[in-house]
């Protein structure tokens, strides 16, 4: 390493760290899809940002290698809960690699949040934060899942949101 | 950018990457002051600190522009519950901005926690966390606010906080 | 500082911040011991890393004194809950110091999720999630505690984990 | 103020029905739990039960669950106490009063009580 | 079920003395720092008045000479100076569990 070379690296770094790798996303009303797939976002509006990370189809795409703590929460909610559906509720974050054909289980989160109302009738709010920090390849792909999607409330971007920073 | 003027950058970047703005509030007796105002919090004592941001009647003051990772844990508690406001709890963090004079809604939890007690005991317990990366300018200032704070159960500075670190 | 002692601190500053300290710990079938220790954690296999910091019987051990944010979260379940189990589980990050006998409490929350069993199964799930900012010298440790650690449900590492990074 | 009305003393014969009336005044109905007590005479006091007056859901001392209904008419903020199957053992006056959660859940006003009286 | 035990079961206090009730839980009343245990005072013909909330709070328009302490599983209700108006009976009452149970009482007599 040359003092021009170790120079150049500095520079680089310097112009790297003005844009550490950083994305808040947050809910739409386009969010939920009831296809199967995962959670969509706002990248722009509001409070919404991209900045070292891009986005495809509700994944945060990763341009940089490194690790990142990812985090996501999502406001749950429902009078009731629908018959049938399992007492458990699973929040994830899940990563999709080129190397890999399935999605990867990152962090998970199981809450039975419908007993919380103390009769069929009762309205009942919840909410599951996820957090923590993962290694991530450059074009390596973070997605939100929600099973089962239909209790997920969204309104104005505050309540369920998604988001990364390189650490 | 001459070799001289990065030179600058670069031990000004260094210098300012030492104080790294960071901040870890604690829940205290003062806290909750049932005024209708976002939470107080102590700033120096035990587990608290301000490392390059500052602290005005329950608001961290940002001095250096950036994206934050802000966060907020509460703990909430009762003995049953009381009837009226407060069968969802609002947990959020909030933004005072010099160009807006109201209040904006950045992170956001609704919970109903009191349908939790067991059978026959009417204790319940829950707790309920925030985070995420926001853009604040120099001057604007993040709070903290429970509704219904009386379900905000302080003891030592662990189990409430309020806290924020730009990334 | 003269420019050769500047641009020395600069090297060393790059190779540091090449590696920021970071971990994440994920649970595994021997995290839970059952002897009133803290929960023990996997450091090597699939998610789990360590990164400028070290481990030891379940404690995160400090190399490099600063501020880090540390995490914590843990899959609560059960059916039912086990006779003459406080309604209250409490879940912590707590920090042992050579210069202090005994753990000091950093971050902690107290949950009653036994109540959340839907009357038509006795099954329920719940998650706690913990994360601050902490200051933390040389040879600190930080641990992770939950009573009563048989409603733990450990399955694949993506359910219980425990993390920090320097801010 | 804070008032809690009851109904007048009963005399049933054994094997009917009752029902106890509580009109409150003077707060927000809907923002206090009712509870019911009994209290036999020459006894002590027997905490029957409690309904939420926001959707009318009850919650009963074990002991009472076979023998009472409780429900409200948010409407004219009455609370009632439905008593069935009526056995010398029900003799007693009940009273309804307002739970405050700020006071810890204590009853902190009372209706005059209602007398029951079980007598062939 | 939390038994709430009274003791003594009547006492005769001399005007302006002190009367001390006790009442015993079977198991802690406590939560964050307050004891659920709360106190009534019940005259002949009337509905019990509540006097203490939460071990040591007094309701508004009680005298100040009637004061409550306490934690735990142990409490105790002190009435000093006793006046006339306070003979009675005296009930205490656990919140924090169902059943919401209440002592045996204690009649209270001025001598």
């Known amino acids: 390493d040359g003092p021009a070379g170790s120079w150049e690296q500095l520079i680089q770094e310097r112009r790297s760290h003005e844009v550490n790798p950083a994305a808040h996303l947050t809910g739409a009303n386009s969010s939920l899809t009831g296809s199967g797939g995962p959670l969509l976002w706002e990248t722009q509006l509001g409070l919404a940002f991209l900045r070292g990370l891009s986005y495809h189809d509700g994944a945060l795409v990763v341009t940089k290698a490194g690790y990142y703590y990812i985090y996501s929460k999502v406001q749950l909610g429902g009078v009731g809960c629908p018959l049938g559906l399992a007492s458990t509720i699973t929040h994830g974050l899940y990563k999709r690699t080129p190397r890999y054909p399935e999605e990867l289980e990152l962090l998970v989160s199981q809450q039975s949040p419908c007993g919380r109302a103390t009769s069929s009738s009762r309205v009942w709010w919840d909410s599951s934060f996820l957090g923590g920090v993962v290694h991530l390849e450059a074009g390596e792909e973070v997605v939100v899942r929600v099973l089962d999607e239909r209790l997920v409330r969204l309104r104005d971007g505050t309540r369920s949101y998604f988001g990364a920073f390189m650490v | 950018d001459g070799p001289a003027g990065s030179w600058e950058q670069l031990i000004q970047e260094r210098r300012s990457h030492e104080v790294n703005p960071a901040a870890h509030l604690t829940g205290a007796n003062s806290s909750l002051t049932g005024s209708g105002g976002p939470l107080l919090w102590e700033t120096q004592l035990g587990l608290a600190f301000l490392r390059g941001l500052s602290y005005h009647d329950g608001a961290l003051v940002v001095t250096k522009a950036g994206y934050y990772y802000i966060y907020s844990k509460v703990q909430l508690g009762g003995v049953g519950c009381p009837l009226g406001l407060a069968s969802t709890i609002t947990h959020g963090l909030y933004k005072r901005t010099p160009r807006y004079p109201e209040e904006l809604e950045l992170l956001v939890s609704q919970q109903s926690p009191c349908g939790r007690a067991t059978s026959s005991s009417r204790v319940w317990w829950d707790s309920s966390f925030l985070g995420g990366v926001v853009h604040l300018e120099a001057g604007e200032e993040v709070v903290v606010r429970v509704l219904d704070e009386r379900l905000v159960r302080l003891r030592d500075g662990t189990r409430s906080y309020f806290g924020a670190f730009m990334v | 500082d003269g420019p050769a002692g500047s641009w020395e601190q600069l090297i060393q500053e790059r190779r540091s911040h090449e590696v920021n300290p970071a971990a994440h710990l994920t649970g595994a079938n021997s995290s839970l011991t059952g002897s009133g220790g803290p929960l023990l954690w996997e450091t090597q296999l699939g998610l789990a890393f360590l990164r400028g910091l070290s481990y030891h019987d379940g404690a995160l051990v400090v190399t490099k004194a600063g501020y880090y944010y540390i995490y914590s979260k843990v899959q609560l379940g059960g059916v039912g809950c086990p006779l003459g189990l406080a309604s209250t589980i409490t879940h912590g990050l707590y920090k042992r110091t050579p210069r202090y006998p005994e753990e000091l409490e950093l971050l902690v929350s107290q949950q009653s999720p036994c109540g959340r069993a839907t009357s038509s199964s006795r099954v329920w799930w719940d998650s706690s999630f913990l994360g601050g900012v902490v200051h933390l010298e040389a040879g600190e440790e930080v641990v992770v505690r939950v009573l009563d650690e048989r409603l733990v449900r450990l399955r694949d590492g993506t359910r219980s984990y425990f993390g920090a990074f320097m801010v | 103020q804070v008032q809690l009305k009851q109904s007048g003393a009963e005399l049933v014969k054994p094997g009917a029905s009752v029902r106890l009336s509580c009109k409150t005044s003077?707060?927000?109905?809907?923002?206090?739990?009712v509870y019911w007590v009994k209290q036999r005479p020459g006894q002590g006091l027997e905490w029957i039960g409690e309904?939420?007056?926001?959707?009318?859901?009850?919650n009963f001392n074990e002991k009472f669950k076979s023998k009472a209904t409780l429900t409200v008419d948010k409407s004219s903020s009455t609370a009632y106490m439905h008593l069935s199957s009526l056995t010398s053992e029900d003799s007693a006056v009940y009273y309804c009063?307002?739970?405050?959660?700020?006071?810890?859940?204590?009853?902190?006003?009372w209706g005059q009580g209602t007398s029951v009286t079980v007598s062939s | 079920d939390i038994v709430m035990t009274q003791s003594p079961a009547s006492l005769a206090v001399s005007l302006g003395q002190r009367a001390t009730i006790s009442c015993k839980a079977s198991?802690?009343?406590?939560?964050?720092?307050?004891?659920?245990m709360n106190w009534y005072q019940q005259k002949p013909g009337q509905p019990p008045k509540l006097l203490i909330y939460k071990a040591s709070h007094l309701d508004s328009g009680i005298p100040a000479r009637f004061s409550g302490s306490g934690s735990g599983t142990d409490f105790t209700l002190n009435i000093h100076p006793v006046e006339e108006e306070d003979a009675a009976t005296y009930y205490c009452q656990q919140s924090i569990e169902d059943p919401l149970t209440f002592g045996d009482g204690t009649r209270l007599e001025i001598k």
């Open positions: 309904i939420n007056p926001t959707n009318g859901d009850p």
């Open positions: 009063t307002r739970s405050n959660w700020d006071y810890g859940n204590a009853m902190d006003f």
């Open positions: 003077g707060y927000t109905f809907t923002n206090y739990y």
């Open positions: 198991q802690s009343v406590d939560f964050d720092g307050d004891g659920y």
